[in-house]
């Protein structure tokens, strides 16, 4: 999946099995990503777990759990909110669209939480003080998660210069810049282009990551996906001067 | 392993604070330079650590793109007091405290927040 | 909780080969560099060697190097110790511990050199 | 490679009362960078070795803060405030600093 880190960073991630999203005092996300095609490097996340540790007089312990084809409003006892506790309403979930959108709030910790299911894969974006981010205590265990650190070199696709490639060669000769066995249905470069450019009409990293995606799956449900995360920055992201993340002028290999 | 508090102090430095450092300035070189020294202080105890080889390579990585020179300036971390986390002896009929910003905000201004979001493939 | 379960010890003769596993679980053992530590009867601890988590760099001591070797399969979350041309003075409990300094030990498995 | 001697090797304590146990090295553990890699270890009888303090004086996560590390170049010294019938066993200085890794000898701690 694309990633943007605690710091802007804008990473394309080949990470597959469960990984550490986020991992802190008060709160530990965990996603499962698999291949997008059998034997691609390309992964999407189908699986997303949330557990909200106990705090003070707040909440209990409370898990929600999201799968793909399964967003439910609530959490996996059953309840809504943070428990019987007496501020079990600082903790909170709301269904925005049934089976496809929901928020969850977390006012204990300043924190809002975006889960979608976009197409057959789930996304994720949240919003959270500096200050819960940095409450690891134990900097050992705690702490190498992909939000904060980013995925691990030897994880990551160069999907720019991929989208670099794909523009230069055109569609026929694709799958040799592709990370991933090209898909069965996939696009033109043109057709892909086109179809973000609707979304998504500013040319940054959200835009490029729609025009990776749909040329390596084919999956137009990935238009929407770059679209919402997008979205979902505008709504979550403090400093509106961020919203769009560009490319790095850099060399490329093969160019001059 | 200390590596990881390297890379907060790396996050702490750059991120929103009332004067960030930003990707384009020399702060952010500094703040960059200073994650490095603390990486090779982590070397002898962190080598072997994917975190310690993440860092080193996000470094290089990050130095090369923002032509960083390995010489000059580096950046002090600036110092946080964490919430309290679990389970507290102290009880409170105060709603406050579980209303991060309520309670922020009698120590601080406004807390600094940060966005991470994961998508597509 | 961290684990780590050694196996593999026992009787030897002295010049012969014996293959020690060590089952890690309760952390993310491909983070990690991972070290074989040994300690003869009523002795003192000696360290024995590292690898890195990713297999790039293997660091051995003196006593060991060349005939011992330390390998993982991050996908088994399992560390080995393959020890060829056995002595009697490496008789002793031997001990995985994860990081690249140790911080958690297994319980230890007991080899015996002795003709 | 780098020696460290311990001493005494067995020390006797009455339950209650401090103990101190000292490492010297054959050289200096401090970095370039002003940092030291020491640790100490402790070894109940028939179990495993224990993290108990590193980089000189840091206690790792779970250790009593009776614990506690302090020195610097070559000597260190650990020290137990108040010596309880848990802490019998035996205790090991390591380095991290220069390869390769090597231990003490041990000191064994006793209850009189």
């Known amino acids: 999946p694309h990633l943007r880190t605690f710091t802007d960073r804008f990473q394309t991630c080949k990470v597959q099995g469960a990984w550490p999203l986020i991992d802190n005092n008060y709160l530990n996300v965990q996603v499962t990503n698999t291949p997008v095609l059998p034997g691609s490097a390309a992964t999407a996340t189908s699986k997303l777990t949330i557990i909200f540790k106990n705090f003070q007089e707040c909440v209990d312990q409370k898990v929600y759990q999201a799968e793909m084809d399964e967003l439910p409003a609530a959490f996996v006892d059953g309840s809504k909110n943070g428990g019987d506790k007496h501020g079990a309403n600082s903790l909170k979930i709301t269904e925005k669209v049934s089976g496809q959108h929901v928020e969850i709030q977390a006012k204990y910790i300043g924190t809002t939480i975006v889960v979608r299911q976009v197409g057959r894969y789930l996304t994720f974006a949240v919003r959270m003080p500096e200050e819960v981010v940095n409450a690891v205590e134990d900097w050992d265990s705690q702490g190498l998660y992909l939000c904060l650190r980013g995925c691990p070199l030897n994880q990551q696709i160069d999907f720019q210069a991929f989208h670099t490639n794909a523009e230069g060669t055109g569609a026929r000769r694709l799958a040799a810049a592709s990370p991933a066995p090209t898909a069965p249905e996939t696009f033109p470069y043109e057709t892909a282009v086109a179809k973000c450019k609707e979304k998504l009409p500013v040319e940054d990293l959200y835009y490029q990551a729609c025009v990776f995606d749909l040329l390596t799956t084919g999956d137009v449900n990935f238009t929407l996906a770059a679209y919402y995360a997008l979205e979902d920055v505008k709504m979550l992201h403090s400093n509106k001067d961020k919203l769009h993340l560009y490319e790095r002028t850099r060399d490329l290999p093969g160019r001059a | 392993c200390k590596i990881l508090k390297c890379n907060s102090e790396f996050w702490s430095a750059t991120s929103g604070s009332h004067a960030p450092a930003s990707d384009d300035t020399p702060e952010f070189c500094a703040a960059l330079r200073s994650y490095a020294l603390c990486t090779r202080r982590t070397a002898r105890t962190c080598r072997g650590d994917l975190a310690y080889h993440s860092a080193v390579h996000g470094i290089e990585d990050l130095m090369s793109q923002h032509n960083c020179s390995k010489d000059g300036p580096t950046s002090q971390p600036r110092l946080r007091t964490l919430p309290p986390a679990g389970d507290s002896q102290e009880r409170s009929d105060s709603p406050e405290i579980c209303h991060y910003e309520k309670s922020f905000h009698k120590h601080s201004a406004t807390p600094n927040y940060t966005h991470c979001g994961l998508f597509g493939d | 909780e961290v684990q780590l379960v050694e196996s593999g010890g026992g009787l030897v003769q002295p010049g012969g080969s014996l293959r020690l596993s060590c089952a890690a679980s309760?952390?993310?053992?491909?983070?990690?560099?991972m070290n074989w530590i040994r300690q003869a009867p009523g002795k003192g601890l000696e360290w024995i060697g590292m690898?890195?988590?990713?297999?790039?760099?293997?660091h051995y001591a003196d006593s060991v190097k060349g005939r011992f070797t330390i390998s993982r399969d991050n996908s088994k979350n399992t560390l080995y110790l393959q020890m060829n041309s056995l002595r009697a003075e490496d008789t002793a409990v031997y001990y995985c511990?994860?990081?690249?300094?140790?911080?958690?030990w297994g319980q230890g498995t007991m080899v015996t050199v002795s003709s | 490679d780098v020696v460290l001697t311990q001493s005494p090797l067995s020390l006797p304590v009455t339950l209650g009362q401090p103990a101190s146990i000292s490492c010297r090295s054959s050289?200096?553990?401090?970095?370039?960078?002003?940092?030291?890699?020491l640790e100490w270890f402790q070894q109940r009888p028939g179990q495993s070795p224990r993290l108990l303090i590193y980089?000189?004086?840091t206690r790792f996560s779970g250790v009593p803060d009776r614990f506690s590390g302090s020195g610097s170049g070559t000597d260190f010294t650990l020290k137990i405030s108040r010596v309880e019938a848990e802490d019998v066993g035996v205790y090991y200085c390591?380095?991290?600093?220069?390869?390769?890794?090597?231990f003490g000898q041990g000191t064994k701690l006793e209850i009189k």
């Open positions: 511990a994860k990081g690249t300094t140790p911080d958690y």
């Open positions: 980089e000189v004086s």
């Open positions: 309760g952390f993310t053992f491909s983070n990690y560099g």
């Open positions: 690898i890195y988590y990713d297999s790039s760099e293997k």
């Open positions: 050289q200096s553990l401090e970095t370039s960078d002003g940092d030291t890699f």
């Open positions: 390591f380095q991290v600093t220069h390869d390769p890794m090597t």
